[in-house]
């Protein structure tokens, strides 16, 4: 018996095509993805294919303007259309609160929405009850499938699940479910979840009775053969592991915002063992046609998105400091914004020793792209931050130790002076350089703001502590040459979109006023500094 | 929270009718995928017949085709199962269920929100 699985994940909001590199889409004969044409793939597959599932591993929320107007009503109508089979729960799905998934998502969808390790607790277990599910058989022709979900244990960090969701282990969670599909006869199992690809491998190798993997979360790209695209291959496709019992369980993630459709084909024998499985993510490019009928209804949602660009967030009544001259060279106030309400975006107080998990922010200055002006009634849109944060990127989280952010900080002055884009911008962090000494030798200072206080206060980065800082994706993937941020990070979640952040903190403060106010410091003569 | 309660079993003479009800709350129905399920003494739990989301498809079980018929009210949160010609064989007790999918089944597998089912006695 043959089946076949299509899955996305990670499409963080990308429902109109976008450009080769995932941002807007410039010109329309070279754009990728997109539920429109996702849907002219899926389709074709589903008539030419007896027994098709499609599947996503989640994380539909959070990444463009459709989120910040539609705030996941459009992730079920445009699911409901394509008519996914069934959803695992993603930590982006908690961004806007249990309510935020419960009313747009889990009420509207046509499809089950799956986690096997969030459970509920206190008042909110009975409001949930039933709208999301550990596990589902899903009839596949004359056979049925269970497909059982998890979430990544990380998502109280990464996001806004509030205090009565309790997200446990995946493998400990997952096991017993496995075992009550074995017990209702339900023997081919596919798991399907958000925890990235190590803990993907873990699952097929540790939960009993899994036959199938198909994750998410860690944006990972396998292919077999040459690579259709820019994305480098982390592995195979499948991804082949060997379970602790001698099977061979295929793995499958198909990188992320909807340029793929990943494509693996199953053949189980009648005791629902695998016996082969093959395939490739398919990546959907222009030679695919966009579905006219998805299409037009894409173009009339859009409409409100055009109006939501214009109108004011909030005001400014000091002149928001962008520009190249500025942020590539000291302190900049625009830099300074960005970076509070980056922070702002992370609190989390899930931990009474911690008045917060993370107090540092690191921002390359050739990533901010614009300055703003107060003197337009010190007005401030969708539009206007779309100028100043225009790459389409998120705002992560990583763990580093002290050493590698003394390299990163050394690496942002190496080369002072040529209007480079490496010069950091920062948060929760106080940094003295002196551009007299030699390049790799110009931090003299570098004090870094305690979480684990009642009153935070500045205290001399320790270079062997691990430490939490929230940076742009582009820095914590090396670039702008931080390649010692993304050899060495100890670990790396992908959080939310630029905009999205710093207008959320915009409408928050309604009135803005940030200054330069000494964060950076920098002197370009011998002086003596005393280290305590 | 989700809740199925039928309504409308009863004894009833062979060759003759009932029409059973489920009533459904919690959630709006035409979301979901009803079945309805019987259950004679001693015998495994069986598919009757089934309904797609918006009742366009519906599917029976050989035992009962031509004879019962399932449809629902989705304005009222109603399904219902009108059965005819009545059989000593269909005596049991029935339920009612509901999953979210795109395929109407008979499987007992794939729904997830039972009702607690209403006795049907098929006697004379």
């Known amino acids: 018996w043959e089946l076949t699985i299509l899955h996305t994940n990670d499409v963080h909001s990308r429902l109109e095509q976008t450009s080769e590199d995932s941002s807007k889409c410039v010109n329309a004969s070279r754009c990728m993805g997109g539920v429109a044409r996702l849907f002219t793939k899926v389709q074709q597959i589903r008539r030419a294919e007896p027994n098709v599932l499609l599947l996503d591993a989640g994380d539909q929320y959070q990444g463009t303007i459709w989120f910040t107007v539609y705030k996941g009503a459009e992730v079920a109508h445009f699911m409901n259309a394509l008519r996914y089979d069934a959803m695992a729960l993603g930590n982006h799905e908690f961004d806007n609160g249990v309510e935020g998934l419960i009313e747009p998502l889990l009420k509207e969808a046509k499809f089950p929405i799956l986690s096997a390790n969030i459970k509920a607790k206190g008042p909110l277990a009975s409001q949930i009850s039933g709208l999301y599910l550990p596990y589902k058989v899903l009839p596949v022709g004359d056979e049925v499938v269970g497909i059982v979900g998890y979430t990544s244990k990380e998502t109280p960090f990464l996001s806004n699940p509030g205090t009565n969701l309790v997200f446990e282990d995946e493998i400990t969670a997952l096991q017993p479910e496995v075992d009550k599909l074995k017990t209702l006869n339900v023997n081919k199992i596919i798991a399907l979840g958000h925890s990235g690809f190590e803990m993907d491998k873990l699952i097929a190798q540790k939960v009993r009775g899994v036959d199938v993997v198909v994750g998410g979360h860690s944006n990972t790209f396998l292919y077999t053969g040459n690579p259709p695209s820019k994305e480098v291959p982390a592995g195979k496709y499948p991804f082949i592991v060997t379970s602790d019992d001698g099977r061979k369980v295929p793995v499958v993630q198909a990188y992320a915002f909807g340029k793929y459709l990943g494509y693996l084909k199953i053949e189980f024998d009648e005791r629902g063992n695998v016996i082969s499985s093959h395939g490739n993510p398919i990546l959907l490019n222009s030679s695919i046609p966009e579905d006219p009928s998805i299409k037009a209804d894409i173009n009339k949602w859009r409409i409100k998105l055009d109006n939501y660009s214009t109108q004011e967030l909030g005001k400014t009544i000091v002149y928001l400091d962008g520009s190249s001259q500025s942020c590539r060279f000291r302190e900049c106030n625009m830099g300074n914004l960005i970076c509070d309400a980056m922070i702002n975006n992370n609190l989390r107080h899930t931990d009474e020793m911690f008045w917060n998990h993370v107090s540092m922010c690191i921002l390359n200055g050739g990533g901010i792209r614009s300055p703003i002006d107060e003197r337009n009634n010190g007005t401030i849109t969708w539009e206007n931050l779309a100028a100043v944060l225009p790459f389409g990127g998120t705002f992560d989280l990583v763990q580093l130790k002290g050493s590698t952010l003394k390299k990163a900080f050394e690496h942002s002055v190496h080369r002072y002076g040529q209007s480079t884009g490496e010069f950091l911008q920062v948060g929760g962090i106080h940094v003295v350089y002196d551009l007299s000494r030699k390049p790799g030798d110009r931090v003299v200072k570098l004090d870094v703001l305690c979480t684990k206080c009642r009153v935070p206060s500045y205290d001399p980065l320790k270079m062997d502590e691990v430490y939490k800082v929230i940076l742009p994706n582009f820095l914590a993937n090396g670039g702008d040459g931080f390649q010692m941020i993304k050899d060495e990070l100890l670990r790396h979640d992908s959080g939310d979109q630029d905009i999205n952040v710093v207008s959320t903190y915009i409408s928050k403060m309604k009135v803005i006023y940030p200054a330069v106010e000494g964060r950076i410091k920098a002197h370009h003569h011998h002086h003596h500094h005393h280290h305590h | 929270a989700l809740q199925l309660v039928e309504s409308g079993g009863g004894l009833v003479q062979p060759g003759g009718s009932l029409r059973l009800s489920c009533e459904v709350s919690?959630?709006?129905?035409?979301?979901?995928?009803i079945g309805w399920f019987r259950q004679a003494p001693g015998k495994e739990r069986e598919g009757v017949s089934c309904?797609?989301?918006?009742?366009?498809?519906?599917y029976y079980a050989d035992s009962v085709k031509g004879r019962f018929t399932i449809s629902r009210d989705n304005a009222k949160n109603t399904v219902y199962l009108q059965m005819n010609s009545l059989k000593p064989e269909d005596t049991g007790v029935y339920y009612c269920?509901?999953?979210?999918?795109?395929?109407?089944?008979?499987?007992?597998?794939?729904?997830?929100?039972w009702g607690q089912g209403t006795e049907v006695t098929v006697s004379s």
């Open positions: 919690g959630f709006t129905l035409d979301y979901y995928n």
């Open positions: 269920a509901a999953y979210r999918g795109w395929h109407p089944s008979l499987d007992a597998r794939v729904y997830d929100y």
């Open positions: 309904s797609s989301q918006s009742g366009g498809s519906t």
